[in-house]
Amino acid sequence: MNSFNYTTPDYGHYDDKDTLDLNTPVDKTSNTLRVPDILALVIFAVVFLVGVLGNALVVWVTAFEAKRTINAIWFLNLAVADFLSCLALPILFTSIVQHHHWPFGGAACSILPSLILLNMYASILLLATISADRFLLVFKPIWCQNFRGAGLAWIACAVAWGLALLLTIPSFLYRVVREEYFPPKVLCGVDYSHDKRRERAVAIVRLVLGFLWPLLTLTICYTFILLRTWSRRATRSTKTLKVVVAVVASFFIFWLPYQVTGIMMSFLEPSSPTFLLLNKLDSLCVSFAYINCCINPIIYVVAGQGFQGRLRKSLPSLLRNVLTEESVVRESKSFTRSTVDTMAQKTQAV
């Protein structure tokens, strides 16, 4: 998303005008942040605290189990992606506080926001991979019995990370530092300059591969899984439905503003009022998308079977039960079964 719509710490919200009147200074300074930026800062702060602590805990719990439990491999990769994304938040936070001034230099401008994107897309694509895994568990149990192993799970994760890297390359290549003459400020953003077609292509590819395709995968997989599990009286439950709806809805809700504004801006002239309005909302859209980075640990805890009873346990042991459990498969973006004793269990208890 283009980021060249920001004001400066020195001159605040500079309001330009088209008349030369020496008696009326054009410099209308204000060091107050815009409302969308304040909201973004609040969200960033909450996401950082919950995301770093929650994902660190998940990494700690799953790291020991990742060699033998496929569940743990999924959770570990998701948590690493989210954790790394959260670590970059203080930089975004600092930039917004300084009215989007970028004091970190050109190399940081290319690398840091690109790392954020890399990890965000890795999270999305891993969710799609997990949902595909669940689909296979339900509909191809014999294939899973024969081929579903830790090695394949790691390969699937590597593919997800690789695709995330590919999605991030355009952002990395076109990301530049621009120093504006007045008001004096340094901005970090994506600049396609002459190539509006390429900007649109990047936005469309990002929308399809980073949003629509995973969303479609999740929706289809969970719809089929629901239909199969609901057809068996023993596994029919409202909790399953709630978790599945939470998975798809949270993904859709939190990424939608970022993707919609991104695609709209790629088709608008940078000087148009709509573009400028959307660009003012950019930080808020990014922060909204960032909620995905802290929502996983929350879902892991809330969706744990017998949650009420487990509250008395310590958080690590609660997470261990949820994340490395092998006897029951749960319906969320975070719950996938790795091994079960019998194929009957595999198809009945998903």
């Epitope: 060249f4 004001t7 020496l22 200074p25 410099d27 003459y181 007045f182």
Partner: antibody
Framework: QVQLKQSGPGLVAPSQSLSITCTVS????????VDWVRQSPGKSLEWLGV???????KYNSALKSRLSISKDNSKSQVFLKVNRLQTDDTAMYYC?????????????WGQGTLVTVSA | DVVMTQTPLSLPVSLGNQASISCRSS???????????LHWYLQKPGQSPRLLIY???NRFPGVPDRFSGSGSGTDFTLKISRVEAEDLGVYFC?????????FGGGTKLEIK
């Protein structure tokens, strides 16, 4: 009426320093930026730097190590100092202002100071 | 730095005819506030440059309406609808969106 008047030496020896003064009238330096631009013989214009109303300065990175811009608000004067002059610093030096942070481009210009760097 | 490329280098024109000068920037000149800080100057022999057009199309006070500016993003044009003798000189385009502000190489308008 807005005016910018320049004063400074016409001939400077290589490796010496150049100092030019720009005295403004018709506006206050406390809320207006003043830029310095030079034009080598038969060539285009080159921006050297700016001093904003709040005293913040910005220089052309290619010349940053040799340039210094300062001002005296009470005297309505802006000063340009160029150190370690070389023969290719021979140019017409202008002070200019956009006024009122308007960024309309350089609306008002000084008459220029022709500086020749020669032994 | 933003490179400003002006064409043509020299423009012979008959008095009363239209003249058109093109200016292209190496980067987008759209400022983060939505404005485009592309300006046009005229420099007559032995004089300081004079601002004609600011922010792409706005005429500076006192500039005749035969001067007009247009363009967006990276491509800009200055048009003089009916060239008069007093219009002769070197025309420069310049940007003050990014640091450092940069100028085009100049276009010399001369009588054919």
């Amino acid at each position: 009426q807005v005016q910018l008047k320049q004063s400074g030496p016409g001939l400077v020896a290589p490796s010496q320093s150049l100092s030019i003064t720009c005295t403004v009238s018709g506006f206050s330096l406390t809320n207006c930026g003043v830029d310095w631009v030079r034009q080598s013989p038969g060539k285009s214009l080159e921006w050297l730097g700016v001093i904003w109303g709040d005293g913040l300065t910005k220089y052309n990175s290619a010349l940053k190590s040799r340039l210094s811009i300062s001002k005296d608000n009470s005297k309505s004067q802006v000063f340009l100092k160029v150190n370690r002059l070389q023969t290719d610093d021979t140019a017409m030096y202008y002070c200019a202002s956009a006024l009122d942070y308007s960024n309309f481009g350089f609306a008002y210009w000084g008459q220029g100071t022709l500086v020749t760097v020669s032994a | 730095d933003v490179v400003m490329t002006q064409t043509p280098l020299s423009l012979p024109v008959s008095l009363g005819n239209q003249a058109s000068i093109s200016c292209r920037s190496s980067q987008s000149l759209v400022h983060s506030n939505g404005n485009t800080y592309l300006h046009w100057y005229l420099q007559k022999p032995g004089q300081s440059p004079r601002l004609l057009i600011y922010k792409v199309f706005n005429r500076f006070p006192g500039v005749p309406d035969r001067f007009s500016g247009s363009g967006s993003g990276t491509d800009f044009t200055l048009k003089i609808s009916r060239v008069e003798a007093e219009d002769l000189g070197v025309y420069f385009c310049a940007q003050s969106t990014l640091v450092p502000p940069t100028f085009g190489g100049g276009t010399k308008l001369e009588i054919k």
